[in-house]
Interface confidence: medium
């Protein structure tokens, strides 16, 4: 969690002088309590936007929005304190808008915003708005707080976002998976541009449990540059027992921007139905998985001939 | 009530740069995406690109190298030029805005916010490639 | 680039009937799938958003169904003012890709 470095921030608007500071997330109020304390936000709205670093960075960031109620205690209103916890980490980021003027009752509902909390893909986070001074004791809360989640780097509005880029997201593999003959799947994808080794796992089950029977990991050493977008083949000896049927294919790619934690591109294929017209139909997903899978190291490129079944996949 | 008006030349000649502008009234061009897709008989609805109100812009590989896409927050506008023009871009061309930020409530407070495609579009413009 | 397929390309029906409109994928695109009308001389409206949400203002006996690469949109009581072209829109990838349309008309 952390702020978005490009500009000044500001929360004075016409009618109030108002500063951003940095924030503890442990208001004084907290400690000294008052005995007039304002009341809570009015519709808290936190909305997905991106926004620009001067070095070009594209980022997802959480603007957050709401109004003050129209009644007088505005006029104990000194402030409010913006909280995001990441809810996966506890990690918590405070700012806190210090007004410098008292608020007046005016014509229009007073509103504030801040949009420089810079958010990360597939994140929830809970936004709480403090008004302050925060309330006394056993007082009426006086914050409003909602969650928010981030659409993860499949969403096309968030693949073109620098932390999407850095962790792979503009990469489709394409992976096509052929069950040979002799106990053998071959895997089939696309490289990206970039000298960096891939990891293929394979991982089966049988199709009435979901614990895992086999599993196997192949290296792909780092392609040259003319091998850049051109198709990897892998070929896997599969598990002598028919019932390990049910293979889950992973393609883990180590690029330079995010070395273990570059999105992983994953394909299901399903036991085959029991009948001569049917043709297993995988199903495809994108999933991010964080940590790295050890395993065998040997890598094959093979030319195995046989009966097979072709799966186009992203 | 959000509102699309697409305008600029009909009729442009082949090999110069096609121009049209989408005025936006009815409400803010700012925290959305806002998009360029046209129409003709033979390619049906193709999607040529689009932009955030902040400049930063996608386009389709296929038009990449002759688009430009281009916002005016103070006016209200976002612009397609689109260079070295042939008859193959004769076409009705529509300005759309893409989605309006969903947010699906579960239980309690639950936000999810994100783009969903375009909500919002113009009536839509002839320009004819002909010389 | 993510190939939309429709099927039918048109179809021939009768006010009161049940009409399914399908739309493939050429990959797994999610729920990140709209469904559009377009009427002749007309920009196209957005009736279903997500797959199956339905744009507010249109009326119920349109419906959206499906995720990954199949797709539905089901009339469950063809009116005369739907006799259109409707079209999918995947937006789940830069470029963002149409179907070629099914033009439903009056038998």
């Known amino acids: 969690l952390r702020l978005l470095d490009h500009r000044a921030l500001v929360c004075s608007q016409p009618g109030l002088n108002c500063t951003v500071k940095n924030s503890t997330c442990l208001d004084d109020s907290w400690i000294h309590p008052r005995n007039l304390t304002p009341s809570s936000p009015k519709d808290l709205q936190i909305q997905l936007h991106f926004a620009h670093t001067q070095q070009g960075d594209l980022f997802p960031v959480a603007h957050i929005e709401w109004t003050l109620q129209t009644d007088a205690s505005i006029l104990y209103l000194e402030g409010a304190e913006l909280s995001v916890l990441q809810l996966n980490t506890n990690e918590r980021l405070c700012v806190k808008f210090q007004f410098l003027s008292m608020l007046q009752h005016h014509r229009k509902r007073w509103r504030f915003s801040f949009s420089h909390f810079v958010v990360d893909p597939g994140q929830e986070y809970e936004v709480t708005v403090h008004h302050l001074p925060k309330p006394i004791p056993d007082g009426d809360p006086n914050h409003q707080s909602k969650n928010f989640l981030v659409p993860d780097c499949e969403h096309a509005r968030m693949k073109v976002t620098t932390p999407c880029m850095s962790s792979g997201s503009l990469w489709d593999p394409n992976i096509t998976v052929e069950t040979l003959e002799a106990h053998q799947l071959r895997v089939s994808f696309t490289l990206w541009n970039e000298s960096t080794p891939y990891q293929v796992l394979l991982e089966s089950f049988s199709d009435s449990e979901n614990h895992s029977c086999f599993d196997v990991v192949k290296q792909i050493f780092a392609p040259r540059q003319e091998e850049f977008h051109q198709r990897a083949n892998v070929t896997f000896t599969l598990s002598k027992f028919h019932w390990c049927c049910h293979h889950h294919v992973q393609v883990q790619p180590f690029f330079s921007s995010c070395l273990n934690d570059c999105l992983r591109h994953a394909v299901t294929v399903p036991c085959p139905v029991i009948s001569n017209t049917t043709v297993p139909k995988p199903v495809a997903d994108y999933i991010p998985l964080w940590e790295p899978r050890s395993g065998s190291s040997d890598y094959k490129d093979d030319d195995d001939k046989g009966s097979s079944h072709h799966h186009h996949h992203h | 009530q959000v509102q699309l008006q697409e305008s600029g030349p009909g009729l442009v000649k082949p090999s110069e740069t096609l121009s049209l502008t989408c005025t936006v009234s009815g409400g803010s061009i700012s925290n959305y995406y806002w998009n360029w897709i046209r129409q003709s008989p033979g390619k049906g609805l193709e999607w040529i690109g689009d932009?955030?109100?902040?400049?930063?812009?996608n386009y389709n590989p296929s038009l990449k190298s002759r688009v430009t896409i281009s916002v005016d927050t103070s006016k209200n506008q976002f612009s397609l030029k689109l260079s070295s023009v042939t008859t193959a871009d004769t076409a009705v061309y529509y300005c759309a805005r893409d989605g309006e930020l969903a947010n699906y409530y579960g239980s309690g407070s639950y936000q999810f916010y994100y783009y969903y495609g375009m909500d919002v579009w113009g009536q839509g413009t002839t320009v004819t490639v002909s010389s | 680039d993510i190939l939309m397929t429709q099927s039918p390309s048109s179809l021939s029906a009768s006010v009161g009937d049940r009409v399914t409109i399908t739309c493939r994928a050429s990959?797994?695109?999610?729920?990140?799938l709209g469904w559009y009308q377009q009427k002749p001389g007309k920009a196209p409206k957005r009736l279903i958003y997500a797959a199956s949400s339905l744009q507010s203002g249109v009326p119920s006996r349109f419906s959206g169904s499906g995720s990954g690469t199949e797709f539905t949109l089901t009339i469950s009581s063809l009116q005369p003012e739907d006799f259109a072209t409707y079209y999918c829109l995947q937006h789940n990838s830069n470029p963002f890709t149409f179907g070629p349309g099914t033009k439903v008309d009056i038998k």
């Open positions: 990959q797994g695109i999610r729920n990140d």
């Open positions: 932009i955030y109100y902040s400049g930063s812009t």
